[in-house]
Interface confidence: low
């Protein structure tokens, strides 16, 4: 009689994570008597997946009634497949004895697991940067299989080309991780901009995953200052305004100096927002010129978002105004919206 053969008809099987995998195995003879066992891997480190004779294998069920005496189909189904289940599975016939001895093995079925990548996480630089500077964004996604994956970067819908991507590990693994770094040049209009990392994988069925980062968390747009003298509001009073334009983020502190001496400090609160997301703010100072014998140097000094202060000065001519002897400087400083 022809010697028993163990037939595993499928060289490979591919299953999505969470599904069940059916691994086929038939034998060509009922002789010799003895159980079938399934293993993952070969050699001394192989892992027992199912033993027909004994043991508890909660995720494994037999496809046919393997307990029947004449049964020759020893196919199994493994439920709730995860990437950790990937590998080559062998159906092995044992000869009954004390102990049972291995008689013949099938050729093996390679189980590959299709696992979806995790949602891409995009992170930007730790510190803010100003327009014209280049900043780096990273994108990470994990846990996918097979290894083939496509990653693209976009800024406001425009695809970026300056990026570098690695998929790890380089060798065989049950699942993989992708890491990409893109370089983005900031512009003054980027407060409302978004950087998008898009990951496409066979498991996503054409619907890529996206991770985003808002450039509002990365950009700092420094303000421009303009100090102007307004017409006299009342006798001996001059209104000087400091217009702070096009800044982001809102965190800003303004100090008025008269001839180098601090007159008043205030924090930008009620600001107006421009269409590009930057802010404008205006502060004014009422100067009592009768309190000054000489010309006054007024300085508007602005500290924006913790950066070194910038300032703009204005020389106020007081010679044309009458002077009251002995009077003190009276200055009023108020913030207001610039409409």
């Amino acid at each position: 009689e022809e010697e028993l053969q163990v037939i595993q008809p499928d060289k490979s099987v591919s299953v999505a994570a969470g599904e069940s995998a059916i691994l086929h195995c038939t034998v060509t003879s009922l002789i010799p008597v003895g159980p079938i066992q399934w293993f993952r891997g070969a050699g001394p480190a192989r892992e027992l997946i199912y033993n027909q004779k004994e043991g508890h294998f909660p995720r494994v069920t037999t496809v046919s009634e393997s307990t029947k005496r004449e049964n020759m189909d020893f196919s199994i189904s493994i439920s709730n497949i995860t990437p950790a289940d990937a590998g080559t599975y062998y159906c092995v016939k044992f000869r009954k004895g004390s102990p049972d001895t291995e008689f013949k093995s099938g050729a093996g079925t390679e189980l590959s697991v299709r696992a979806k990548p995790s949602a891409p996480v995009v992170s930007g630089p730790a510190a803010r940067a100003t327009p014209q500077h280049t900043v780096s964004f990273t994108c990470e996604s994990h846990g996918f299989s097979p290894r083939d994956i496509t990653l693209k970067w976009f800024k406001n819908g425009n695809e970026l080309s300056d990026f570098q991507t690695n998929v790890d590990p380089v060798g065989e693994s049950v699942s993989y991780s992708i890491h990409s770094t893109a370089k983005v040049v900031l512009t003054r209009e980027d407060v409302h901009s978004q950087v998008i990392c898009e990951v496409a994988h066979v498991t996503l069925q054409g619907d890529p995953l996206r991770g985003t980062a808002n450039l509002s968390e990365t950009i700092r747009v420094p303000p421009t200052l303009e100090v102007t003298q307004q017409p006299v509001r009342a006798e001996n009073q001059v209104n000087v305004t400091c217009q702070v334009r096009k800044f982001y983020p809102q965190r800003l502190q303004l100090t008025w100096l008269e001839n180098g001496n601090v007159s008043r400090t205030e924090t930008a609160s009620t600001v107006t927002e421009n269409k590009d997301g930057t802010y404008n703010w205006m502060s004014w100072l009422l100067v009592n010129v009768s309190a000054h014998r000489d010309d006054v140097k007024l300085t508007c000094q602005v500290e924006h978002d913790g950066q070194p202060a910038v300032s703009k000065s204005h020389d106020l001519k007081v010679s044309a105004h009458p002077k009251e002897q002995g009077s003190n400087t009276a200055a009023e400083n108020t913030g207001s919206n610039e409409r």
């Epitope: 990437p83 995790s118 790890d168 590990p169 380089v170």
Partner: antibody, heavy 121, light 107 residues
Amino acid sequence: EVQMLESGGGLVQPGGSLRLSCAASGFTFSSYAMSWVRQAPGKGLEWVSAISGSGSSTHYADSVKGRFTISRDNSKNTLYLQMNSLRAEDTAVYYCAAYSGSYYYYGMDVWGQGTTVTVSS
Amino acid sequence: EIVMTQSPATLSVSPGERATLSCRASQSVSRNLAWYQQKSGQAPRLLIYGASTRATGIPARFSGSGSGTEFTLTISSLQSEDFAGYYCQQYNNWPYTFGQGTKLEIK
């Protein structure tokens, strides 16, 4: 055979410096992120520092930041840890370990046998 | 930094029995968690990564589960060589941090 061998440990006074080395063999060194992990006598494991496969990215534990510097020479298959301003609490066995990829994902699956650093006056 | 807390500090189990070790993160680390085994006088050995994936050459009796902040390492039937120290480590946020360890001893 994959191997990593640390060296450079020894006895040093507080405030002193040491440079640890880890020579790797049996694998493509530049393809793997590397790390230093330490273990004080009778204590648990403490992650110290990590460096990406290319060397472009480094990270440190708060306890060593500003004092220790991790670096690598991929042409020599060697990882380094420059330790300055050493303190008594830096006394430990220092292990070098390799991550499973060029970035720091998965675990550290290859370890050296460790080198002992003792900081004492 | 993320604080990893392991419990119990010491676990006494008889050979052949099941051992369950716990690890809790002070904030979510997703599934970015590894388990290591360390025998006295030896370097650590990676057992599990990705919370549940066995590393190369690790026997099937070791299994990991959990995600977010709660994780478990289970050794289904303890062998004599399994009595050692076990550490969890998160690699979701820098700095990467280990738990303080669980010592598994023979009952």
